[in-house]
Interface confidence: medium
C-alpha cells in the first residue's frame, strides 16, 4: 500500500531572465527511493539517480542545475518556461509518486510564490 | 526475452588492442545503462566500465582507466569495449551486462550476457 | 579499487539456513546497501537481490536480503542443492565513483 505524500512548491511564478528552485520532498513512507525523475510536460529534464547522482538532459545543460538536495533549479528564465513541472519518485517497494508544480514566468517583477500544497 | 550476446574475444599479445561488442534485444536498449563486468579464470567479478543510456556518464574502474574505453550505437542496439595495451592481467570473460532503467532507476545488473574470452598471452 | 569483504566459502546441510554476508563501508554498502548476484559454475551471474531487499521476478523467497551498518547479509532458507553456488555482493562506492564486488562466497550444500 502507497502511504507516502509529496509536498511540493506548489503554484509558482517568477520573473523572466531570473531562476527559480522547484522543489518536492516525499514524506510519510519508508520506501527506498531509486530515483528522482524531473519532466516538463513529457520532456525529461533531469535524473536524480540514487546510486550515480544528477544526470541532466543535454537540451537543457545550460540553463538547469541540480540541486539543492532533489530539487532542481531553473535558470534564464523565459516565459517559454511556463508550464506544468513534474517530480516523480521511484521507489521500492511503493512505487512512483508524482508531485505537480506550476511555473508561471512573468515579464515584470511582481512574481510571487504561492502556498506549498501536498499529493497524495 | 532481454537478450545479451557478447563477440570480439580471443588471443592477443600484450599491449595490442581488441574490441568487444555486445549486441543488445528483446528491450528498449537506449532507455538502460550498460555494464562491462569481467572474471579471470577461476577468480571472482570484477566491474570494468558502466555507461549511461546517452553516454553522458561514464566511469571505470582504476585497473583500466586510461586504457579502456567503454561507448554506445543506440542505433545498432549495441555497446563496445575498445580495450588498448592489454595485459596479462586483462585475461578473463568479459561479460555485458544490463544498468539502470532511465524512467526508474530498478534492477541494476538484472540480465548478463554469456560473456566472451579475451586471453593476453605472448 | 578496495572491494567489499565475504567470507571465501559457506558449507550448510540439506534444508537448513545459510547467512551469507557482504562487509564494506560507509561509502558503499552502508550508503546504499548492495546487490546480490548467485553464479553456478560455467554460466554467467543471476541478480538475486537489488539495494538490499529488492527481488527481482522469479526470485525464489526463500532468500532474503537485509543491511545492518556497513555489512549486508543474504538469506537463503531451507536450501537445496542447485542452491550450491558462487555469491557475490556488490555495491556503488561514491568515493571510487565505481562499482565495487565482493570476493564471492562458495556456498556448499551437504
Known amino acids: 500500500m502507497m502511504t507516502g505524500t509529496i509536498e511540493t512548491t506548489g503554484n509558482i511564478s517568477a520573473e523572466k531572465g531570473g531562476s527559480i528552485i522547484l522543489q518536492c520532498h516525499l514524506s510519510s513512507t519508508t520506501a527506498q527511493v531509486t530515483q528522482v525523475n524531473w519532466e516538463q510536460q513529457d520532456q525529461l529534464l533531469a535524473i536524480c539517480n540514487a546510486d550515480l547522482g544528477w544526470h541532466i538532459s543535454p537540451s537543457f545543460k545550460d540553463r538547469v542545475a541540480p540541486g539543492p538536495g532533489l530539487g532542481l533549479t531553473l535558470q534564464s528564465l523565459t516565459v517559454n518556461d511556463t508550464g506544468e513541472y513534474f517530480c516523480i519518485y521511484h521507489t521500492y517497494p511503493d512505487g512512483t509518486y508524482t508531485g505537480r508544480i506550476f511555473l508561471e514566468v512573468l515579464e515584470s517583477s511582481v512574481a510571487e510564490h504561492g502556498a506549498r500544497f501536498q499529493i497524495p | 526475452q532481454v537478450q545479451l550476446v557478447e563477440s570480439g574475444g580471443g588471443v592477443v599479445q600484450p599491449g595490442r588492442s581488441l574490441r568487444l561488442s555486445c549486441a543488445a534485444s528483446?528491450?528498449?536498449?537506449?532507455?538502460?545503462?550498460m555494464h562491462w563486468v569481467r572474471q579471470a579464470p577461476g577468480k571472482g567479478l570484477e566491474w570494468v566500465a558502466l555507461?549511461?543510456?546517452?553516454?553522458?556518464?561514464?566511469y571505470y574502474a582504476d585497473s583500466v582507466k586510461g586504457r579502456f574505453t567503454i561507448s554506445r550505437d543506440n542505433s545498432k542496439n549495441t555497446l563496445y569495449l575498445q580495450m588498448n595495451s592489454l595485459r596479462a592481467e586483462d585475461t578473463a570473460v568479459y561479460f555485458c551486462a544490463r544498468g539502470y532503467d532511465l524512467l526508474t532507476g530498478y534492477y541494476n545488473f538484472d540480465f548478463w550476457g554469456l560473456g566472451t574470452l579475451v586471453t593476453v598471452s605472448a | 579499487q578496495a572491494g567489499l569483504t565475504q567470507p571465501p566459502s559457506v558449507s550448510k546441510g540439506l534444508r537448513q539456513t545459510a547467512t551469507l554476508t557482504c562487509t564494506g563501508n560507509?561509502?558503499?554498502?552502508?550508503?546504499?546497501?548492495a546487490a546480490w548476484l548467485q553464479q553456478h559454475q560455467g554460466h554467467p551471474p543471476k541478480l538475486l537481490s537489488y539495494r538490499n531487499n529488492n527481488r527481482p521476478s522469479g526470485i525464489s523467497e526463500r532468500l532474503s536480503a537485509s543491511r545492518s551498518g556497513n555489512t549486508a547479509s543474504l538469506t537463503i532458507t531451507g536450501l537445496q542443492p542447485e542452491d550450491e553456488a558462487d555469491y557475490y555482493c556488490s555495491a556503488w562506492d561514491s568515493s571510487l565513483s565505481a562499482w565495487v564486488f565482493g570476493g564471492g562466497t562458495k556456498l556448499t550444500v551437504l
Open positions: 555507461i549511461w543510456f546517452d553516454e553522458s556518464n561514464i
Open positions: 528483446g528491450f528498449t536498449f537506449s532507455s538502460y545503462g
Open positions: 560507509s561509502n558503499n554498502v552502508g550508503n546504499r546497501g
